[in-house]
């Protein structure tokens, strides 16, 4: 996240951390479901843990965290490597969550965003571009949903509706490490960071978003045929 | 250097348990899942399953009830058990590590396993 | 099922042709295939993974595309050490998978 700020704590509990070994952060992820979380599909990899609960970047221990192995990966079928449509991945947890303060699903938002909406982008992505600089701790940002109009101008054919734009001041924005955590717009998830320009932050460049309210048909489905 | 190795008898009764170990070595396997797979000779390449650290397996179908995959990292080795054989078990049986973006890069050479009486 | 179709099961080309294998998934994979090559009394060796990108040390005149359920091997100028056999493997799922790989497709010296 470029400059943003630190979350407070407890605020975020749906937030997870995709790990390689030993400890290497390489995407967020969101809490959707007691066992369920959802990411970007282009996050996917065979082996990695699941760290939910914890708030800063190192693998010190806390004691709100709870980790996980994913036992299935299910990518959107319409995903395709290396293109940015459909850019979402259900994963199947080894077990349920306890919930606690620190760790709680948050629910998919079946209305889709309207220009102008106020939301929150959070991760432990690189707080700078085109250097990288992780945080110390989980990194919020308030960012505004563009209009459809706003983003194909900025991406010109490069954008459809399973994606969406949106942005703050030049400057400010999600950036690498942050794909797959959460969009959350009136308390519910909206959008998945997705992908963008690099350097991240550039003007007339926002982030762009996988658009989850034309997926929750998707997602409850493959949820219910897996569980 | 990385390199896996099959090792194990090269005859096996009918009805009787093929075994088969791969020794792994110059990479730890808490880092990687493996797979094991075979080939009938003259014929293509079959998966029978994969196995990833946390010791989750996933089975081919057709091989469910009847092959049993483990690992044991302080030994860092991957096993492979395929009971009651039939002489269409007769294959080459390979193992493999996945390069975490779902491709096998790694492939041992292979043992061949005749079941025969 | 997830079952993988190549196509042709085996071709016959010379040295310096463009050749194509193609292979199809009764249903989406997304873009989770892999292209193997196999010669005589060798293990297989990665191609190609995630459909289009290449392994390491790979030759660049292998290159493999497509998306869902139609994926495409293409050498651009097969050379003499090219004659193999190519298999196609999914990695979208392993639930309730009789097998992962193609039936393999043989370049034969024309």
């Known amino acids: 996240i470029i400059n943003g700020s630190d979350c407070d704590m407890h605020t975020q509990p749906w937030q997870a951390a995709l790990l390689l070994r030993p400890n290497q952060l390489y995407c967020g992820a969101v809490l959707v479901h007691p066992q369920w979380l959802l990411t970007a599909a282009h996050c996917r990899k065979k082996v990695f843990r699941v760290r939910l609960g914890h708030y800063s970047l190192s693998p010190v221990y806390e004691s709100g965290q709870q980790m996980f192995q994913g036992v299935k990966s299910i990518p959107h079928p319409g995903y395709s490597h290396p293109g940015h449509s459909n850019d979402l991945m259900l994963i199947k947890l080894n077990r349920r969550i306890r919930p606690t303060k620190d760790v709680r699903p948050i629910n998919v938002s079946s209305h889709c965003p309207s220009a102008g909406t106020k939301c929150l982008v959070s991760g432990w992505g690189t707080t700078k571009s085109p250097q990288v600089h992780f945080p110390k701790v989980l990194q919020c940002l308030n960012i505004s949903v563009l209009s459809q109009k706003r983003c194909e101008d900025a991406y010109p054919r490069q954008i459809d509706d399973t994606m969406f734009c949106a942005g703050d001041k030049a400057g400010r924005d999600s950036c690498q490490g942050d794909s797959g955590g959460p969009v959350v717009c009136n308390g519910s998830l909206q959008g998945l960071v997705s992908w963008g320009d690099y350097p991240c932050a550039r003007p007339n460049r926002p982030g762009v978003y996988t658009n989850l309210c034309k997926f929750t048909k998707w997602i409850q489905e493959t949820i219910q045929a897996n569980s | 250097e990385v390199q896996l190795q099959e090792s194990g008898p090269g005859l096996v009764k009918p009805s009787g348990t093929l075994s088969l170990t791969c020794a792994v070595s110059g990479f730890p396997l808490s880092n990687y899942a493996m797979s094991w797979v075979r080939q009938p000779p003259g014929k293509g390449l079959e998966w029978i399953g994969d196995i990833y650290p946390s010791d989750i397996i996933d089975y081919a179908s057709w091989a469910k009830g009847r092959v049993t995959i483990s690992q044991d990292s302080s030994k860092n080795q991957v096993s492979l058990k395929l009971s009651s054989v039939t002489a269409a078990d007769t294959a080459v049986y390979y193992c493999?590590?996945?390069?975490?973006?779902?491709?096998?890069?790694?492939w041992g050479q292979g043992t061949l396993v005749t079941v025969s009486s | 099922a997830y079952d993988m179709t190549q196509s042709p099961s085996s071709l016959s080309a010379s040295v310096g042709d463009r050749v194509t294998i193609t292979c199809r998934a009764s249903q989406s994979i997304s873009s989770w295939l892999a292209w193997y090559q196999q010669k005589p009394g060798k293990a297989p060796k990665l191609l190609i993974y995630l459909a289009s990108t290449l392994a390491s040390g790979v030759p660049s005149r292998f290159s493999g595309s497509g998306s869902g359920t139609d994926f495409t091997l293409t050498i651009s100028s097969l050379q003499p050490e090219d004659f193999a056999t190519y298999y196609c493997?999914?990695?979208?799922?392993?639930?309730?998978?009789?097998?992962?790989f193609g039936g393999g497709t043989k370049v034969e010296i024309k």
């Open positions: 493997q999914q990695g979208y799922t392993n639930s309730n998978i009789i097998n992962t």
């Open positions: 493999a590590r996945d390069n975490n973006d779902y491709g096998l890069d790694i």
